[in-house]
Interface confidence: low
Amino acid sequence: GTDSGSEVLPDSFPSAPAEPLPYFLQEPQDAYIVKNKPVELRCRAFPATQIYFKCNGEWVSQNDHVTQEGLDEATGLRVREVQIEVSRQQVEELFGLEDYWCQCVAWSSAGTTKSRRAYVRIAYLRKNFDQEPLGKEVPLDHEVLLQCRPPEGVPVAEVEWLKNEDVIDPTQDTNFLLTIDHNLIIRQARLSDTANYTCVAKNIVAKRRSTTATVIVYVNGGWSSWAEWSPCSNRCGRGWQKRTRTCTNPAPLNGGAFCEGQAFQKTACTTICPVDGAWTEWSKWSACSTECAHWRSRECMAPPPQNGGRDCSGTLLDSKNCTDGLCMQNKKTLSDPNSHLLEASGDAALY
């Protein structure tokens, strides 16, 4: 503790001009009291005949100092080291606006040197976040902002973000950006960014987790192209035909909107009816030919086949023997292009 009256330390010592002013090899550093653990402050100086701590403007009792002395190998000068402990109680007993501070004063024959002030603070981290991230549903490729204001703390809490319990490292995944005010930005939401996000605040006292925010990256559905129209339902006359499309271009995902509109279209259709062909009446029999045959013919024209109707079945020509005709000797064949049917004449012999 400090002792303001029982000991009086000299303001200076007799000087010897050959010795320089004390120089601090180690100055006391700012420290935080965690829970009830006292902190240790340390000074090293040379040349130094004495080193004492002063806290909040008052000398610390000599009994509370632990002093060591040794030679500095490089210079051969005498190095003095001193340390004190500061307890939580001491810090709490300091009332006022100023933080608890301590500094070292070192003496040599040349005079005194003061170290920097080291501040001792009671470390804490409040439980509640000033702002916690909120879950959201976002379209694919959109920017997402997750906000986090960590709890008040001494020292000020550091913030990191977890994605499904894994620490986000923006240097590894440049789609993530951590802002100076601890917010997380997802630049272009990917489907793989659908996850639980947690803001974690930590300092030397504790680690606090925010509530978890669920980010869902969704894809709204889009229609595929229409399929071809189906064939008309009736082969002949009036009927219906339909076509379909599907909500797969892309398919909706993670609660994205289903396509609006019809997946099915129906329209009336008329197919011209096919007309099957039919034969005309047979022609009259021809006169008896030189081959002793006569012929008759017909055509598939009553009506002709139309719109994919069936052709007539059967023969175009019909023939049969005849005995009433005069059959010529050395007769020509029907296949001869000069052949012709001869009428019976008086020059021909009767059979």
Partner: antibody
């Protein structure tokens, strides 16, 4: 007409590997969420893995993560499930299905893991 | 992961009965829930998507509804061909199915 046909199932020893194929016709798998769903004998349906080629996205059930890999060859309009380090509990009929609401399913292919 | 708790696991009913099957999501899944029918040895068939939309070709006696995270499949008048196992499924990745409800003849 939309059709999904699975193949590649069979008997395999524990620790072995199999590759299942799902040949799709009548639609483009590039734009469709494709799933593998399995059903162990006498049990319910269990989602295994999904791929969404449109967004280069894959997702797996915890039970198969690190062992199974889903992929798609959009030029062949076929999805695949590469199954490594197979266990007895992977024995099931494996179905492939299309869409986020699974509107079309294949007939299924049986995978038996047994020594 | 989101759990889908389906009930009952089985039920006995007669032709003409009204049948209700429910699924509760462990967290919000918006309306991204589908219902399937499966018969032994066959692949499942989609009945309802987006919680309440009837899939094309499915008879109108099937309907779906949502109340918060509770989802219901209703068969208004059970037909002989409706005896099967029914599953709900949520479409937030990772996808999960309910445990199934077997509808048997009383």
């Amino acid at each position: 007409e939309v059709q999904l046909v699975e193949s590649g199932g069979g008997l395999v020893q524990p620790g072995g590997s199999l590759r299942l194929s799902c040949a799709a016709s009548g639609f483009n798998i590039y734009y469709s969420y494709m799933h593998w769903v399995r059903q162990a004998p006498g049990k319910g349906l269990e989602w295994v893995a999904s791929i969404y080629s449109y967004s280069s996205y894959t997702s797996y059930a915890d039970s198969v993560k690190g062992r199974f890999t889903i992929s798609a060859d959009t030029s062949k309009n076929t999805a695949y499930l590469q199954m490594n380090s197979l266990r007895a509990e992977d024995t099931a009929v494996y179905y492939c299905a299309r869409h986020y609401a699974m509107d079309y399913w294949g007939q299924g292919t049986l995978v038996t893991v047994s020594s | 992961d989101i759990q889908m708790t389906q009930s009952p696991s089985s039920l006995s009913a007669s032709v003409g009965d009204r049948v209700t099957i429910t699924c509760r999501a462990s967290q919000s899944v918006s309306s991204a829930v589908a219902w399937y029918q499966q018969k032994p040895g066959k692949a499942p068939k989609l009945l309802i998507y987006s919680a309440s939309s009837l899939y094309s070709g499915v008879p109108s006696r099937f309907s779906g509804s949502r109340s918060g995270t509770d989802f219901t499949l209703t068969i208004s008048s059970l037909q002989p061909e409706d005896f099967a196992t029914y599953y709900c499924q949520q479409s937030y990745s990772p996808f999960t199915f309910g445990q199934g409800t077997k509808v048997e003849i009383k």
